[in-house]
Interface confidence: low
Amino acid sequence: KELKVTQPEKSVSVAAGDSTVLNCTLTSLLPVGPIRWYRGVGPSRLLIYSFAGEYVPRIRNVSDTTKRNNMDFSIRISNVTPADAGIYYCVKFQKGSSEPDTEIQSGGGTEVYVLAKPSPPEVSGPADRGIPDQKVNFTCKSHGFSPRNITLKWFKDGQELHPLETTVNPSGKNVSYNISSTVRVVLNSMDVNSKVICEVAHITLDRSPLRGIANLSNFIRVSPTVKVTQQSPTSMNQVNLTCRAERFYPEDLQLIWLENGNVSRNDTPKNLTKNTDGTYNYTSLFLVNSSAHREDVVFTCQVKHDQQPAITRNHTVLGFAHSSDQGSMQTFPDNNATHNWN
């Protein structure tokens, strides 16, 4: 009977970690000689298995090749890794007497595609916090997947974003691949509760994409609006000043009251009010004894937020000397306010 080496499958796909069978059957055992499996062709091809009874990790013959009438030379590769990808050939040799064995026929080859899951996407953002209206870039990386076809999408609060650039490396054929994508996000003051999500879909993920998440709270700074106001006096000789820092993030806030340029009180906020948009408010009360002041006094509220330059707001309170202007209040365009003591 004429010898024919048949590899019925042109290709097989296997998930990394699983096992696969590479089928090979012969129509005749003649001429006498070994059958060997190789990966690749030419002088650099790699011998995979030779049915010589040797132990090869992860590879076994499917049928008992020691039986005289066996014509099934299929092999099972277990715990497949991306490095096992390639074209496998089942090759029949004629046994040589003194010279080396001679290759007489090869099967058509079976390409093994190793399906390797992408790693969970990692989203990284800028090292420093950005401010509202600033454009910041986020990068998403995932590696170790195969085959090369992969889909990566960006979302912000459910809305899909268009990436600046997405690259899959290497560009040539390889055992596994990496993807990197960059997206640009314009920050806004409502982003403290927002998330940027990188979603990776791949054939190995069974319609359940992997997601990497960046909480914008880690990348945004919203500076406070600072206002100083004078409350109605609680008694004849007391003035209540209020410094209110509104809608700031993160929490890191230092507040200092100055009296005519001299530090009067350090206020370390403890009980911040949280707004629904994730930002914070803080109100500092400063009680001033008016009987100790006859001259005009400039009170300054100095707010340092997240190690940024201080925001200052002045408020002038008129002394007793301004008797004609008692009870009056003037607010100046630069947010300096003037009041008298009584």
Epitope: A15, G17, D18, S19, N79, S208, I213
Partner: antibody, heavy 119, light 107 residues
Framework: QVQLQESGPGLVKPSQTLSLTCTVS??????????WSWIRQHPGKGLEWIGA???????YYNPSLKSRVTISVDTSKNQFSLKLSSVTAADTAVYYC???????????WGQGTTVTVSS | DIQMTQSPSSLSASVGDRVTITCQAS??????LNWYQQKPGKAPKLLIY???NLETGVPSRFSGSGSGTDFTFTISSLQPEDIATYYC?????????FGGGTKVEIK
């Protein structure tokens, strides 16, 4: 239809090693695509995941128990096993084994085996 | 570890009532959440996988919804055989963690 059956001693002395085996029937442990897990339930309490093994090697442990736990698989016997060393009374619980598909939940459970740690 | 907070810890309802159990994750777990039923002296039984998919053979009165951190499990019409403890379980991050359980009783 895959079925699971836990086996092992019901009483273990403190400081000794608890050893349990889960036998898989009605399917092959090496068919791929599944995790084989151990879960325990302290008396009157909730469920605690101990760890899982994928037949081809990867093993995952709960960090709270990692230093004391070993999970292994024997594909020839279609079994996987749990060893928990240096046990104390706090390890007294019902121990379950389960089959889990990553996106199909723990869909098959053993009936559970009660292990008491006492001298 | 991801903490799964289930509420209420127990409830009592009449046959035919609609019963709702919530489960809150300490971090975003997408839809990587399962729901189980455990009857006294028995092993848990999978009811819902991937937050909202009904396991084969489970009655349609059971349903699940939610994504991210907040999830809901519903029995649309409570039956006597539904007396059990119900657990949620996340598998987004190792280690897998379960909620504390909700014991459902009949009034």
């Amino acid at each position: 239809q895959v079925q699971l059956q836990e086996s092992g001693p019901g009483l273990v002395k403190p400081s000794q090693t608890l050893s349990l085996t889960c036998t898989v029937s009605g399917g092959s442990i090496s068919s791929g695509g599944y995790y084989w897990s151990w879960i325990r339930q302290h008396p009157g309490k909730g469920l605690e995941w101990i760890g899982a093994i994928y037949y081809s090697g990867p093993i995952y442990y709960n960090p709270s128990l990692k230093s004391r736990v070993t999970i292994s698989v024997d594909t020839s016997k279609n079994q996987f096993s749990l060893k928990l060393s240096s046990v104390t009374a706090a390890d007294t619980a019902v121990y379950y084994c389960s089959k889990e598909g990553y996106h199909s939940g723990m869909d098959v459970w053993g009936q559970g085996t009660t292990v008491t740690v006492s001298s | 570890d991801i903490q799964m907070t289930q509420s209420p810890s127990s409830l009592s309802a009449s046959v035919g009532d609609r019963v709702t159990i919530t489960c809150q994750a300490s971090d975003d777990i997408s839809d990587y959440l399962n729901w189980y039923q455990q009857k006294p002296g028995k092993a848990p039984k999978l009811l819902i996988y991937d937050a909202s998919n009904l396991e084969t053979g489970v009655p349609s009165r059971f349903s699940g919804s939610g994504s991210g951190t907040d999830f809901t499990f519903t029995i649309s019409s409570l039956q006597p055989e539904d007396i059990a403890t119900y657990y949620c379980q996340q598998f987004a991050y190792l280690p897998w963690t379960f909620g504390g359980g909700t014991k459902v009783e009949i009034k």
